[in-house]
């Protein structure tokens, strides 16, 4: 087919036609279908769902839909030897045991294969000892304990409340502090919003509800046994002792009823301040150990989970591009859930399904996108982003040459207050322009744009009159595409009001109570927020795949680079004397940022003025835009994190969920006053400044006039 023949872009087949085809009722139906039984990674049920999705995507009209499988390390509780935690008396008798399962919600009592709460990849073990309460187990919590309160966690079992940071970071911090085990619990202060009933009468966490989750510290590695390479049939696998990111101490999660029993007996030091106290009727003493009358009692963990190499399945659907079939726009979200996945992931998977259906409808009418669109249903996201990472490892050479953009599609909702977007600065203008064209679903904003309600409810902290867009961190399937491969990425979902709802995530996250009914009764009865998210995600994909000139604005990268350079310089200037002593200068970085700003503006002028009808010129300019994100990749990666290679953004070393800017410099400066060898530490700061400078300058040069 000639390119002119293939495009078929008529006024009938435009963005409006695509958006109009999206229906809330379909999303509701798909969500119901995806949430009737558990779809745990590595199980037969999740394989069957993969085959169902493959079949339906074919019916919807995609050109091809394939299953790709990998054999990766997963982790499951031992069915005959359950995990639990005890309080034992001086004779070793168990006088209290935590529950072995969550009471299933009404109507689900007879569902089989509900995995009991566990911390995936916990090693086996039965440590016993005194308890220390470590608040959220953040870096700063351990600083407070060890440095200010002089409390030693070595040989102790620590109990930490969920929230604020990724659970894997909590476990890593506890290990470094010398703990022999970790108990994670959900405190009502973080998972019970005032004035709301607990499930099934509301969306709050009941006392027996527990958050599952993996506790890995993979740093982008994918399958722990095959870092850097796909876990296929001929892959070399490391021994378990050499596996990446596995915790070394037993870990187990509990609900707040069980936590009450452990925390009410705590003695030792009082909590340092109110930020360490939750909402349970317990003293929140730090310990170590129990108070006077109970001081001879200890805590014992009984963890018997096993890690095993298990087959997982991704579903990859292709809608071939008419003009640039070798340019890929990817929409991906995971399919595996901890239990029913009412929100995570199926509220996202249902939206992807409807987006595929809408694109398929247009395709059946003779339309094709300009560029190829790839749709992905990832497996084993909950076990460390394994499906997406293995697929990207297998296809890395294609992706780094052809990948235009990746749009993530996990949970569509984590609340019903306003939009939440995290993306590369290249997509800021795309997101703003799109949301100005979409109708707000919010009450009180009838007839107003999504942009307007979003700006009102979630204003940018720096730039007035604009909505907040956050940095990409990790904890979801965009990680390998953005942080490792440097493919422009973004994500969007509906969120809670962060001002009034201080709890972390949504209360029923990763619990058995995350059901279809939770969504349909309490979060989005009309599925209007799901529809809006479908319009945002789908609209972004449509524009990225169909715009003649890629909808990326490099000027917005210039703006944030200036902001990030200012921020890191201000952090560094908390040490003016050392800056002088070790001749640390940010002049080169500021110069590179200025050069980037200048070149980006000149590029934008050329982009506006060039002859769009010249296919060679068009391809050349689009390639410069596509490869700009790639130019921020350092092939050597960040220190000790070889798969985090983006120099401008990385997941925070202290919280995988959060993004950090100029992470190499940031980490080199972090807690630098405590380093044993200040000369070496400041030398590393200088090295990181030089890497950042080179990278920004090199990226700028990719935007320079080619000849």
């Amino acid at each position: 087919k000639s390119s002119s023949e293939a495009t078929n872009i008529t006024p009938k087949h435009n963005m409006k036609a695509f958006l109009d085809e999206l229906k809330a009722e379909n999303i509701k139906k798909f969500l119901h279908n995806f949430t009737q039984i558990p779809h745990l990674a590595g199980t037969e049920q999740n394989f069957q769902l993969a085959k169902q999705i493959q079949s339906q995507w074919k019916e919807f009209g995609l050109d091809s839909v394939e299953l790709t499988h990998y054999d990766v390390l997963l982790s499951y509780p031992n069915k005959t030897h359950p995990n639990y935690i005890s309080i034992i008396n001086e004779d070793g008798n168990e006088i209290f045991n935590t529950s072995l399962f969550e009471p299933p919600p009404a109507g689900y009592e007879n569902v089989s294969d509900i995995v009991p709460p566990f911390s995936a990849f916990s090693p086996q073990g039965m440590p016993e000892g005194d308890l220390v309460y470590v608040n959220y187990a953040r870096t700063e919590d351990f600083f407070k304990l060890e440095r200010d309160m002089k409390i030693n966690c070595s040989g102790k079992i620590v109990i930490a409340r969920y929230g604020k940071v990724f659970r894997g970071n909590k476990v890593k911090n506890a290990q470094l502090a010398g703990a022999t085990g970790v108990i994670l619990y959900s405190d009502p202060a973080d998972y019970f919003a005032p004035g709301v009933k607990s499930y099934p009468d509301g969306w709050n966490l009941p006392g027996g509800g527990v958050q599952r989750g993996n506790i890995l510290n993979l740093n982008g590695a994918g399958d722990p046994l095959t870092p850097g390479y796909p876990a296929n049939e001929y892959a070399y696998r490391r021994g378990i002792a050499e596996a990446v990111g596995l915790p070394s101490i037993p870990v187990h999660p509990i609900g707040y009823y069980d936590a009450q029993k452990l925390l009410e007996k705590m003695g030792g030091s009082a909590s340092p301040d109110s930020s360490w106290r939750g909402s349970l009727k317990v003293p929140y003493n730090v310990g170590p150990g129990f108070t006077g009358n109970f001081s001879t009692q200890k805590v014992k963990m009984h963890i018997h989970s096993t890690s095993e190499v298990t087959r997982i399945y991704n579903v990859i659907g292709t809608l071939r591009g008419a003009v640039e079939p070798d340019r890929y726009v990817i929409l991906g979200g995971h399919r595996d859930s901890w239990v029913f996945g009412g929100i995570d992931p199926q509220s996202g998977a249902a939206v992807v399904h409807e987006i595929v259906r809408s694109f398929g409808t247009l395709k059946k009418e003779g339309w094709r996108p300009r560029r190829t669109i790839l749709f992905a249903s990832w497996d084993a996201e909950e076990f460390g982003l394994l499906g997406s990472t293995e697929w990207a490892e297998e296809n890395s050479r294609l992706l780094q040459e052809r990948g235009v953009a990746y749009i993530n599609a996990d949970s569509s909702i984590e609340g019903n207050y306003t939009l939440r977007v995290d993306c590369t600065p290249l997509m800021y203008s795309l997101v703003y322009n799109l949301t100005k064209e979409l109708e707000s679903p919010d009450e009180g904003f009838e007839g107003k744009s999504l942009y307007e309600s979003w700006t009102k409810k979630s204003p940018s902290p720096e730039f007035s009159g604009m909505p907040r867009i956050s940095k990409l961190g990790s904890g979801n399937d965009f990680e390998v595409f953005f942080q490792r491969l440097g493919i422009a990425s973004g994500r969007a979902r509906y969120t809670k009001n962060w001002e009034t709802n201080k709890f972390s995530s949504y209360p029923l996250y990763h619990s058995v109570y995350e059901t279809y009914e939770l969504v349909e009764k309490f979060y989005d009865p009309m599925f209007k927020y799901h529809l809006t998210v479908a319009q945002v995600r789908g609209g972004m994909v449509f524009e990225l795949a169909n715009s003649v000139v890629l909808p990326f604005d490099c000027r917005d990268y210039a703006v944030v680079l200036r902001k990030y350079a200012d921020k890191i310089y201000n952090i560094s200037m908390k040490h003016p004397q050392e800056m002088k002593t070790y001749s640390v200068s940010f002049d080169s970085l500021f110069s590179a940022v200025k050069n980037f700003t200048e070149i980006a503006s000149k590029f934008s002028e050329r982009l506006r003025d060039f002859d769009k009808s010249n296919p060679i010129l068009l391809r050349m300019m689009n390639d410069q835009l596509m490869f700009l994100e790639r130019a921020f990749i350092d092939p050597l990666g960040l220190p000790d994190r070889p798969f985090y290679r983006h120099v401008i953004y990385a997941p925070s070393s202290h919280n995988k969920y959060a993004g950090e800017s100029f992470p190499g410099i940031y980490d080199a400066l972090f807690d630098i006053e405590s380093k044993v060898d200040p000369s070496q530490a400041w030398g590393e700061v200088k090295r990181q400044i030089s890497i950042a400078t080179f990278t920004v300058q090199a990226a700028a040069e990719t935007l320079s006039e080619v000849a």
């Epitope: 604009m466 000027r555 210039a558 703006v559 503006s601």
Partner: antibody, heavy 121, light 111 residues
Framework: EVQLVESGGGLVQPGGSLRLSCAAS????????MSWVRQAPGKGLEWVSA????????YYADSVKGRFTISRDNSKNTLWLQMNSLRAEDTAVYYC??????????????WGQGTLVTVSS | QSVLTQPPSVSAAPGQKVTISCSGS????????VSWYQQLPGTAPKLLIY???KRPSGIPDRFSGSKSGTSATLGITGLQTGDEADYYC???????????FGGGTKLTVLG
């Protein structure tokens, strides 16, 4: 040839509002940060606000934060400054200035002729 | 009170050399580029020096700029009566996320 022409100044009572405009020509307006700089009678230059190229991120001096709003329309090559809750100390000549480097403010290579704003009862 | 400090006035005879200082801090002049502006009576400011020491086309080489640490200096040699004007230094402040100016220096050419 680059031209910046301000308009919209005038006499206004304390607490009142005024909207200044700056019509730009002779350069790719959308690619450059634009600023408003003011000069009270007999006094020095005071930067008021800037708006970036691209999506139009905004920056304000503390003295006007929450009262003034800068905006731009790239399709019309126009910059605006909406001034609310005006005070006597806002009396000044307001200049529109173009950044020389690009999307964020570095230094100003072109200035308008200025428009006088007088806040008085 | 301006963030950057300049002397209120300087004066010198025609043909002489004059320098105008501009003092700031690590968050502005210390890390960012300094520019200088000339404002002739009754006119809009005009860019004189950018990037600490560069001259836009059309600005004679009698005007020079330098920066050291947290201070910057504008030098004018071969003073002419037409140089009588107010001179302002300016830069970005990385802590304030704002453009900052000096209070201005009135140059009088004696004679």
């Amino acid at each position: 040839e680059v031209q910046l022409v301000e308009s919209g100044g005038g006499l206004v009572q304390p607490g009142g509002s005024l909207r200044l405009s700056c019509a730009a020509s002779g350069f790719t307006f959308s690619s450059y940060a634009m600023s408003w700089v003011r000069q009270a009678p007999g006094k020095g230059l005071e930067w008021v606000s800037a708006i970036s190229g691209g999506i139009g991120s905004t920056y304000y001096a503390d003295s006007v934060k929450g009262r003034f709003t800068i905006s731009r329309d790239n399709s019309k090559n126009t910059l605006w400054l909406q001034m609310n809750s005006l005070r006597a100390e806002d009396t000044a000549v307001y200049y529109c200035a173009k950044d020389a480097v690009g999307a964020t403010p570095y230094y100003f290579d072109y200035w308008g002729q200025g428009t006088l704003v007088t806040v008085s009862s | 009170q301006s963030v950057l400090t300049q002397p209120p006035s300087v004066s010198a005879a025609p043909g002489q050399k004059v320098t105008i200082s501009c003092s700031g801090s690590s968050s502005n002049i210390g890390i960012n580029y300094v520019s200088w502006y000339q404002q002739l009576p009754g006119t809009a400011p005009k860019l004189l020096i950018y990037d600490n020491n560069k001259r836009p086309s059309g600005i004679p080489d009698r005007f020079s700029g330098s920066k050291s640490g947290t201070s910057a200096t504008l030098g004018i040699t071969g003073l002419q009566t037409g140089d009588e004007a107010d001179y302002y230094c300016g830069t970005w402040d990385s802590s304030l996320s704002a453009v900052v100016f000096g209070g201005g220096t009135k140059l009088t050419v004696l004679g």
